[in-house]
Amino acid sequence: EVEKTACPSGKKAREIDESLIFYKKWELEACVDAALLATQMDRVNAIPFTYEQLDVLKHKLDELYPQGYPESVIQHLGYLFLKMSPEDIRKWNVTSLETLKALLEVNKGHEMSPQVATLIDRFVKGRGQLDKDTLDTLTAFYPGYLCSLSPEELSSVPPSSIWAVRPQDLDTCDPRQLDVLYPKARLAFQNMNGSEYFVKIQSFLGGAPTEDLKALSQQNVSMDLATFMKLRTDAVLPLTVAEVQKLLGPHVEGLKAEERHRPVRDWILRQRQDDLDTLGLGLQGGIPNGYLVLDLSMQEALS
C-alpha cells in the first residue's frame, strides 16, 4: 500500500502519458486521478510502467470501482490484467468477444493462469453456451482448452461449434470427454462425403461406438495406427479380424508393433487364432482352435 502524501506542486497529471513513468509510486498515488485513469485506460498499455507502478494504478481502479470494473475499462487493461486476482475477475461482467481477445492476448504464449480460467468461465457462463466464435478464439489461444472442460461443460457445446476444433485441440482429451464430443462431431459433419467425413471425424473417434467403427470399415478409410490406438477398448473388442483389416487397410501391419498395448492386446485375446493368422503378421494370443467362446456379457443380459 502506497502511503498517502500530497501531490508535489506542478506534478498533478492532466492526462495519462509517458511522463508518468518517471513518477515514484507515491507520486502516482497522489497525482493521478482515478477517474482520469479510467477514461484513458487505452493509453496505459502503451506506456512502459514498471510492475510496481502498475500496482498503484490497479489500486486506484479498485478504489474507484469496488463492485468490479466496467467493460470499458476491462477491455483496455492490457498488462494490468496480469495483476488481477480470480476474486477481482469474478466481479466482472464481460460480454464482448473483443474484450476477451484483448485480455487473452496479454497472456499469449503462457500457460492458462487462474485469472484466465476465471475470465473464460465468467465469459462462457454469461453467454450461456460455447458458441463457435468463442470456441474459435479460445482454442486459438489455448489449443488444450476444450480438454480442460468437464463432460458436463462440454455438453453445452453446440454441434455447429465443432467446426472450429482442430486435431491438436483434442490431444489431451480423455475418453469421457470424447464420448461427449463424438456425437456432436458426427452430427456436425453428417453431410460430408466419405473421405472428407473421415478426415474431419478422425480426431473424435476416441468416442466412437462399435457400430460406427464397423460402418467406417466398409468405407476404405485406411485409419492410421495412432488413431486406432486411441479408440475405446470396449468399441474395438467386438470388431472381427476382417473388419479391423478393412478399417486399417495398409496400416494393418502396424498391429504387430502394438500387440502388447491396449486396445490391440485385448482385441487379440478375443479373436480366434486362425483368424489372426490370416493377417500373416505373426500375432499371438488369440483363442486356440477347437475352443468354444462364451460371451458372458450376453448371458448376463439374458438372465
Partner: nanobody, 116 residues
Framework: QVQLVQSGGGLVHPGGSLRLSCAAS????????MRWYRQAPGKERDLVAL???????YYEDSVKGRFTITRDNPSNKVFLQMNSLKPEDTAVYYC???????????WGQGTQVTVS
C-alpha cells in the same frame, strides 16, 4: 544465475562524457525493458532513461538531449552515453532489467559517476 554487470563509471570534469555499460548473463535482454536509475547521496533513486524491448527510448527531463540509451541485443548489453555532464549528474547509476509480465526484476551492482 542472472547477473547484470556494470562498467564505465568514474570521475569526469563538467562538460565531459562517460559511457556506462550493462552486460547481462542468464537472461536475454532483448525481452526486457531496460532502465538506468541514479541515486545521489541522501536522495531517492530516480529513473533517468528507459529503452523498451522494441527499442523505444524515454528520458527524464533534466537529461534530455545529453544522455542516450541504446541496446545491443546480440551482445546482450545496454549502454548509457552521457554527454555534457554537470555536477548535478553526480550519483551512483544502476541498470535494471524488468518485464511487465513478472514481479521479478534484476539490478546491476551500481557504478559511481562523479562530475567535478
Amino acid at each position: 544465475q542472472v547477473q547484470l554487470v556494470q562498467s564505465g563509471g568514474g570521475l569526469v570534469h563538467p562538460g565531459g562524457s562517460l559511457r556506462l555499460s550493462c552486460a547481462a548473463s542468464g537472461i536475454d535482454l532483448s525481452l526486457y525493458r531496460m532502465r538506468w536509475y541514479r541515486q545521489a547521496p541522501g536522495k531517492e533513486r530516480d529513473l533517468v532513461a528507459l529503452i523498451t524491448d522494441d527499442g523505444t527510448s524515454y528520458y527524464e527531463d533534466s537529461v534530455k538531449g545529453r544522455f542516450t540509451i541504446t541496446r545491443d541485443n546480440p551482445s546482450n548489453k545496454v549502454f548509457l552515453q552521457m554527454n555534457s555532464l554537470k555536477p548535478e549528474d553526480t550519483a551512483v547509476y544502476y541498470c535494471n532489467a524488468e518485464t511487465p509480465l513478472s514481479p521479478v526484476n534484476y539490478w546491476g551492482q551500481g557504478t559511481q559517476v562523479t562530475v567535478s
